[in-house]
């Protein structure tokens, strides 16, 4: 969490941002809140980005003002106009691109004063893994697949029964570039698995960590997946 205060003029207002990550090709949110004002027409929101000539987005007098919007962001940004009055200056960013990563500034002017806060935005690709039994293999084998990751992640297998065991000798991981030449499909195979055990396939890069679990018994197979973003810090 980053909390910024205005430093110029007689009055300052508190602006709060939260560092976050965007999944390329999908929509993302850059979070920013501020001390609300009672009059929408008195609120100015400016989003700026380090290295960008011009503005990422500007909202003033109750509407978007995009005359200085940089071409990199044209047609891809929106504020939640109905929530500005209650202090929400968050920016919706459509079709997140790798190049959107960087340091953003949320700058607010209201009748009470000015304030700003920076936000670190990371971009990459992350997806939920799915673990299945590979019935085509000669021995009991598990196959963990996740369709989109970037940058290249690490893959680690773990087992509930053999906690702390190193499975690198009995697993094989490959990365296949997807058609857009940036993200990659992750495939990891674990050999010599035993039944009545729960195995976890953990995929991690500097943006996200995802885990796919599979429990194999003689009577059933249970699966569970979850994904966690690693860098959500408020400022």
């Amino acid at each position: 969490l980053i909390i910024g205060f205005g430093i110029s003029g007689r009055h300052s207002i508190t602006v709060t941002t939260v560092a976050s990550a965007g999944n390329i090709g999908e929509d993302g949110i850059l979070s920013c809140t501020f001390e609300p004002d009672i009059k929408l027409s008195d609120i100015v929101i400016q989003w700026l980005k380090e290295g960008v000539l011009g503005l990422v987005h500007e909202f003033k007098e109750g509407k978007d003002e995009l005359s200085e919007q940089d071409e990199m962001f044209r047609g891809r940004t929106a504020v939640f106009a109905d929530q500005v009055i209650v202090g929400n200056a968050s920016l919706r960013l459509k079709n997140v691109q790798l190049t959107d990563a960087g340091t953003y500034k949320c700058y607010i002017i209201t009748s009470k004063g000015k304030g700003n806060a920076n936000l670190e935005y990371k971009t990459g690709a992350f997806s939920m893994p799915e673990v299945n039994v590979d019935y085509n293999a000669s021995s009991e084998t598990l196959r963990c697949e996740a369709p989109r990751w970037f940058p290249q992640p690490t893959v680690v297998w773990a087992s509930q029964v053999d906690q702390g065991a190193n499975f690198s000798e009995v697993s094989n991981t490959s990365f296949e570039l997807n058609s857009e030449n940036v993200t990659m499909k992750v495939v990891s195979v674990l050999y010599n698995v035993t039944i009545n055990n729960t195995y976890s396939c953990m995929i991690e890069n500097d943006i996200a960590k995802a885990t796919g679990d599979i429990k194999v018994t003689e009577s059933e197979i249970k699966r569970r997946s979850h994904l966690q973003l690693l860098n959500s810090k408020a400022s």
Epitope: L53, G54, S67, T99
Partner: antibody
Framework: EVQLVESGGGLVKPGGSLKLSCAAS????????MSWVRQTPEKRLEWVAG????????YYSDTVKGRFTISRDNVRNTLYLQMSSLRSEDTAMYYC????????WGQGTSVTVSS | DILMTQSPSSMSVSLGDTVSITCHAS??????IGWLQQKPGKSFKGLIY???NLEDGVPSRFSGSGSGTDYSLTISSLESEDFADYYC?????????FGGGTTLEIK
């Protein structure tokens, strides 16, 4: 067809001034952030200054800050670079171009600073 | 400032060859990199932007790749019009900075 045509270069004495122009046609000039880049006689490239699409935001390299001023006229579709207190190390071919190294570049105008 | 180290500074190659030019940034630039071509006595032509995107009208034998601090421009099956100077430029931060250039010469 997109065209960027620079003019205003020439021979000038150290301490002198020049104003470069870059006339744009064939593109919606007001949509794009623009830059001036220079190429030294040794072929080294140096970014000089940039300006936002509407002209309110400008950035300069440290080597020219306080001496050069970038501006634009979106009605006349023209980018400018006012250069003052010129030094011998400002000698270069000056190019205007669309920001981010994207396509559209002018053919350049030569600036020589020498006594 | 971000330092862009480009290599090689020159290379002698033959028609039909595949060549790669690399640029190393002194810090991560999140694919905020472009590649430019300059023919002798001429201006610049943008080839690649955002690390991997081909500018309109640029032949598909040109491709860009890389992430973090390391990026490359690859030209497959070189044609006679490809013999020129090539530069990378980063636009993650101000000031924009360029690589030192690579001259492709006919062997």
């Amino acid at each position: 067809e997109v065209q960027l045509v620079e003019s205003g270069g020439g021979l000038v004495k150290p301490g002198g001034s020049l104003k470069l122009s870059c006339a744009a046609s064939g593109l919606t000039f007001s949509r794009y952030a623009m830059s001036w880049v220079r190429q030294t006689p040794e072929k080294r490239l140096e970014w000089v200054a940039g300006i936002s699409s509407g002209g309110s935001y400008t950035y300069y390299s440290d080597t020219v800050k306080g001496r050069f001023t970038i501006s634009r006229d979106n009605v006349r579709n023209t980018l400018y670079l006012q250069m003052s207190s010129l030094r011998s190390e400002d000698t270069a071919m000056y190019y205007c171009g669309r920001e981010y190294g994207r396509d559209y570049w002018g053919q350049g105008t030569s600036v020589t600073v020498s006594s | 400032d971000i330092l862009m180290t480009q290599s090689p500074s020159s290379m002698s190659v033959s028609l039909g060859d595949t060549v790669s030019i690399t640029c190393h940034a002194s810090q991560g630039i999140n694919s905020n990199i472009g590649w430019l071509q300059q023919k002798p006595g001429k201006s610049f032509k943008g080839l690649i932007y955002h690390g991997t995107n081909l500018e309109d009208g640029v032949p598909s034998r040109f491709s860009g790749s890389g992430s973090g601090t390391d990026y490359s421009l690859t030209i497959s099956s070189l044609e006679s019009e490809d013999f020129a100077d090539y530069y990378c430029v980063q636009y993650a931060q101000f000031p924009r900075t360029f690589g030192g250039g690579t001259t492709l010469e006919i062997k």
